[in-house]
Amino acid sequence: ARNGDHCPLGPGRCCRLHTVRASLEDLGWADWVLSPREVQVTMCIGACPSQFRAANMHAQIKTSLHRLKPDTVPAPCCVPASYNPMVLIQKTDTGVSLQTYDDLLAKDCHCI
Amino acid sequence: ARNGDHCPLGPGRCCRLHTVRASLEDLGWADWVLSPREVQVTMCIGACPSQFRAANMHAQIKTSLHRLKPDTVPAPCCVPASYNPMVLIQKTDTGVSLQTYDDLLAKDCHCI
C-alpha cells in the first residue's frame, strides 16, 4: 500500500529518488568494469514521516512504534521499491563481457 | 549477495531481528482487530556498516558513496529481507473475519 505522497516536511525533504554522479573509482569498480566510466546512480534518499509512502503493514507498525518508543524503534527508512537494470562491460577471466545487473539503480522509492 | 555477517561494531549492534512487544492500542488497531491482543512485532533494527549484510549491488554502491559523500548519501538501512505471515481476527461490516497479513512480521534482515 503506497500511502500519502504529500511531504509534511516541505518539498523534496521526504523519501524520493535522487541522482548521484559517480565514477568507477568512486564505486571501487575501476579494476573490473570498463564501461560506463561514470554512472548516474539513482538512489532513495529522504525522511519517512508518519505514513509517507508506507510500503506495507510493517512500515505502518514501525511508524506507530517509533512514535511510542523513538529510542528503541527507528523510523521507517527510504529504500528502493523497484530497480532499473544496468548493463556493464566488465573484465572476465577470458576477456570482456556484457553483464546485466538488475538491482543496481533504484527506480522507485518507498518507506519501510 | 549477502555479504559479511560479522558486526564490526560489537555483538548485537548491527542490523538484525529484534522483537518488540506491542498492544493493539500501541499499534492503533484496537478499533478493528479483536485478536491477538498483543503482538510480538519482529523488526529489523541496527547499524549497517560497510558491506554488512548488503542486500544487493545497490547496497554496495550506497556504502561506497556514503563513505565518499556522507552528508549527501546516507548509509544503507536495516530492513526486512523477508516476512512471516500473521493471522488477525478482525472486525468487518458483517461481523468478524480471519485475515492473513503477509507483510507484517519481519523474518530476516538485510541492509539496503
Epitope: 570498463l34 564501461s35 556493464l88 562491460i89 572476465t92 577470458t94 570482456v96 | -
Partner: antibody
Framework: QQLKESGGRLVTPGTPLTLTCTVS????????MTWVRQVPGKGLEWIGI?????NTYYASWAKGRFTISKTSTTVDLKITSPTTEDTATYFC???????????????WGPGTLVTVSS | DVVMTQTASPVSAAVGGTVTINCQAS??????LAWFQQKPGQPPKLLIY???TLASGVPSRFSGSGSGTEFTLTISGLQCDDAATYFC????????????FGGGTEVVVK
C-alpha cells in the same frame, strides 16, 4: 579455435529461419558472441550479443525480428519472419568486438548467405 | 539508440600518404569503439579496439584515437594493400546495450 556459420539458404518471406554458429576450441560459457550481417554491397549491421551466461542484447531495430540463443557448442540466430530486406550475409564473431579477448584474438566466421525472395 | 556517423566514401591518397577517417557517436560511448578493415568476400578484420589499442598482428601504421563521441582512425605510410573499406563499431551501455557500425569508408590508394 574456429567459428562456422550454417543454415543460410533461399527462403520465402515470412518463413522463419535459424542460422547456427558452431564453435570449436573454446567454451561458450566463457565468451560473449556477436551476430553481424551485411547486405550485399552495403555496410555492416550489428544485430546483437548473447553473453557468457546466456543473456541477450539486441540492436533496437533488431528487437522482435531476431532471437539469439545458444547450446554448449552452438549459437543460433533465428530470423522470426524474414522479409526481402533481410537478404544478407550473416556473420558470428567471438566477443563484444569493441574490446579484444585476452590473447588479443578476434574470431569471425566466414559468413552464411540468406536470400529472402518470393 | 546509438548511431555511428562515419566519414563519407571514398577517401583517396597516394602510396606513402596519410588517410584519416572520423567516426562520431550519437551517445557517449567512452572508449567502447573498434575499427575494422574489410575486403570483398571476407569477414571484417579487427584493427583497433578500445578506441586506441592496436590489435595483434596489425601494422603500427594504423592508429586510433578519441573517446566519448569523437573518434579517428589514421593510416600513415599508406600501402596498396590498405585499399579496403573501413568500419567503426560503437557499443553503448546503460540500462540496456546497443551497438552500431558506421556506414563504412572506402579507401582508395593511388
Amino acid at each position: 579455435q574456429q567459428l562456422k556459420e550454417s543454415g543460410g539458404r533461399l527462403v520465402t518471406p515470412g518463413t522463419p529461419l535459424t542460422l547456427t554458429c558452431t564453435v570449436s576450441g573454446f567454451s561458450l560459457s566463457s565468451y560473449d558472441m556477436t551476430w553481424v550481417r551485411q547486405v550485399p554491397g552495403k555496410g555492416l549491421e550489428w544485430i546483437g550479443i548473447i553473453n557468457n551466461s546466456g543473456n541477450t542484447y539486441y540492436a533496437s531495430w533488431a528487437k522482435g525480428r531476431f532471437t539469439i540463443s545458444k547450446t554448449s557448442t552452438t549459437v543460433d540466430l533465428k530470423i522470426t519472419s524474414p522479409t526481402t530486406e533481410d537478404t544478407a550475409t550473416y556473420f558470428c564473431a567471438r566477443g563484444i568486438l569493441v574490446y579484444a579477448d585476452y590473447g588479443d584474438h578476434n574470431l569471425w566466421g566466414p559468413g552464411t548467405l540468406v536470400t529472402v525472395s518470393s | 539508440d546509438v548511431v555511428m556517423t562515419q566519414t563519407a566514401s571514398p577517401v583517396s591518397a597516394a602510396v606513402g600518404g596519410t588517410v584519416t577517417i572520423n567516426c562520431q557517436a550519437s551517445e557517449d560511448i567512452y572508449t567502447n569503439l573498434a575499427w575494422f578493415q574489410q575486403k570483398p568476400g571476407q569477414p571484417p578484420k579487427l584493427l583497433i579496439y578500445a578506441a586506441s589499442t592496436l590489435a595483434s598482428g596489425v601494422p603500427s601504421r594504423f592508429s586510433g584515437s578519441g573517446s566519448g563521441t569523437e573518434f579517428t582512425l589514421t593510416i600513415s605510410g599508406l600501402q596498396c594493400d590498405d585499399a579496403a573499406t573501413y568500419f567503426c563499431l560503437g557499443v553503448y551501455t546503460y540500462i540496456s546495450a546497443d551497438g552500431a557500425f558506421g556506414g563504412g569508408t572506402e579507401v582508395v590508394v593511388k
